[in-house]
Interface confidence: medium
């Protein structure tokens, strides 16, 4: 039997279903507009309402801002007409889409206002070190609610070459397992890229001064990161897990990863940054246990034990 489309359209009812919504965390910067997204399907046509911090929120009734609300949609954009406006709209938002058959609810959308990132003003003293010694050049980017990417460059905007000896850690610091006279430069610059504000900021240049020596003394490995012998961390099921070990010493130590509590899940493990970083994709219950990094050179070794507890996300 063929049922005409128009017949079906009039008689088949559908409860509301949220089809599109903003991410759970939304960071708004001072020069941005605020856009909150909520789309839903349903028959008869759904009606939308919003709450902020549990209280009914009507974007169109907000004073001193321009609001664009899409027709047949719960999505809206608030145009910022002053540098303080994002502050006013911080909070936890929720969208409700209703028709005769019921109500669908979006997840909680946490809207955070953040200042455009700036590095604290500081005077950077030259870093003096003897050839063969280790050194850490700090980056310390400003705190940010959004993820940021760190790069080390020189004043000619050329990336600092990284290898087994020279490594940038997850924290943004630049680690030298041992320095060579060729590392002697006055313009090590840490750049922080904040995708949310389309902003790149740079730290004051660091002047690394390497004093030449006639004989470089061999040193057994020592961990620069982490500095303690063991650490405990919680990994969430289904999320990635990143473990890191950075060592100093001369000759340059190599890093190995072991799993005393069982086999390494080879299909889900990748090693990056010249083996200094172990990344486990999509953590599962079976990944619970100890992961050990071993830094070795001809004079000896240093180790760190990560004790990982897997919890439900």
């Amino acid at each position: 039997i063929q049922i005409p489309e128009e017949y079906e359209g009039h008689h088949v009812m559908e409860p509301p279903v949220i089809t599109e919504q903003s991410p759970r965390r939304l960071v708004v910067f001072p020069t941005d507009d605020i856009s909150l997204k909520c789309e839903a399907s349903g028959k008869p046509e759904v009606q939308f309402r919003w709450t902020r911090d549990g209280v009914h929120f009507k974007p169109k009734e907000e004073l001193g801002v321009t609001v664009y609300q899409s027709p047949h949609s719960g999505s809206f954009t608030i145009t910022g007409n002053n540098s303080n406006f994002a502050q006013r709209f911080q909070g936890i938002y929720r969208c409700f889409a209703s028709n005769k058959l019921g109500t669908a609810m979006s997840h909680e959308i946490r809207l955070m206002a953040e200042g455009a990132p700036k590095w604290p003003k500081e005077t950077v003293k030259p870093v003096e070190v003897e050839e063969g010694e280790s050194v850490v050049l700090p980056c310390n980017p400003p705190p940010s609610a959004e993820p940021l990417r760190i790069y080390w460059m020189n004043s000619k905007i050329l990336h600092i070459k990284q290898d087994e000896r020279v490594t940038m850690g997850q924290n943004g610091n630049l680690y030298f397992a041992n320095v060579l006279t060729s590392d002697n430069h006055s313009d090590y610059i840490c750049h922080a890229h904040f995708p949310g504000t389309r902003t790149i900021i740079q730290k004051e240049p660091i002047d690394l001064r390497v004093k030449a020596t006639n004989s470089m003394i061999d040193r057994k490995p020592r961990l620069l990161f982490p500095t303690n012998s063991s650490s405990h961390l919680v990994a969430l099921q289904g999320q990635p897990l990143v473990l890191e070990c950075i060592a100093e010493g001369f000759p340059t130590p190599t890093i190995k990863w072991l799993r005393p509590s069982g086999p390494m899940p080879a299909d889900r493990v990748t090693y990056q940054n010249h083996n200094k970083t172990l990344q486990l994709l999509k953590v599962g219950e079976e990944d619970d246990g100890e992961y050990r990094c071993l830094a070795e050179n001809s004079l000896g070794s240093a180790r760190h034990a990560y004790y990982v507890t897997v919890e439900a996300a």
Epitope: F29, T31, N82, S83, N84, F85, E114, K118, T199, I201
Partner: antibody, heavy 118, light 113 residues
Framework: QVQLQQPGDELVKPGASVKLSCKAS????????MQWVKQRPGQGLEWIGE????????NYNEMFKSKATLTVDKSSSTAYMQLSSLTSEDSAVYYC???????????WGQGTSVTVSS | DIVMSQSPSSLAVSVGEKVTMSCKSS????????????LAWYQQKPGQSPKLLIY???TRESGVPDRFTGSGSGTDFTLTISSVKAEDLALYYC?????????FGSGTKLEIK
């Protein structure tokens, strides 16, 4: 590092207009609202208004609405303030300053001294 | 508009002395959603631009000596210099950035005896 460069002095005749500039460097120009502040000799500070360099949106102190016009040139990372129908009351130092919607005005230009005299 | 009142208008102290200056606003500067007071203190030395000392009423700007302390909440605020140095000779302004138009106090002039 962040710098806001303003020319030192402007001498203008009563009734004329003047366009003050503020050249920004060392940060992403479109990420901060630019503020303008007036200081008459021996007097306090008065907020004139602000402009969002990313979209040119402005917000003025009512007192200066008919006096000042704020604009930006994104290509040169420069903010401008045009002052019209100048009188002796407009003789002052005018500062541009950065405010990022969060931490107050933490970077200031050196100021342009405007003297209105025939 | 929010009116900012500063007192005293001037004061003269000896090096090493403790100084407090007051700033009162005609409306509360406490922003409920993040519990921060939108008040800043600036220092302006003769012939120079203002320099930010304190924001959010009590947070010291990086690079500002720890002898400068901001305190208060709502409508009453204080800037304290624990042990005045000769280089602290300046005008000190408070400013609210809670509501438009932003407004400044008339300033406190600090002189050294």
């Amino acid at each position: 590092q962040v710098q806001l460069q303003q020319p030192g002095d402007e001498l203008v005749k009563p009734g004329a207009s003047v366009k003050l500039s503020c050249k920004a460097s060392g940060y992403t120009f479109t990420s901060y609202w630019m503020q303008w502040v007036k200081q008459r000799p021996g007097q306090g500070l008065e907020w004139i208004g602000e402009i969002n360099p990313s979209n040119g949106r402005t917000n003025y102190n009512e007192m200066f609405k008919s006096k000042a016009t704020l604009t930006v040139d994104k290509s040169s990372s420069t903010a401008y303030m045009q002052l019209s129908s100048l009188t002796s009351e407009d003789s002052a130092v005018y500062y541009c300053a950065l405010y990022d919607g969060y931490y107050a005005m933490d970077y200031w230009g050196q100021g342009t001294s405007v003297t209105v005299s025939s | 508009d929010i009116v900012m009142s500063q007192s005293p208008s001037s004061l003269a102290v000896s090096v090493g002395e403790k100084v407090t200056m007051s700033c009162k606003s005609s409306q509360s500067l406490l922003y409920s959603s993040n519990q921060k007071n939108y008040l800043a203190w600036y220092q302006q030395k003769p012939g120079q631009s203002p320099k930010l000392l304190i924001y959010w009423a009590s947070t010291r700007e990086s690079g500002v000596p720890d002898r400068f302390t901001g305190s208060g909440s709502g409508t009453d605020f204080t800037l304290t210099i624990s042990s005045v140095k000769a280089e602290d000779l300046a005008l000190y302004y408070c400013q609210q950035y809670h509501s438009y138009p932003f407004t400044f106090g008339s300033g406190t002039k600090l002189e050294i005896k």
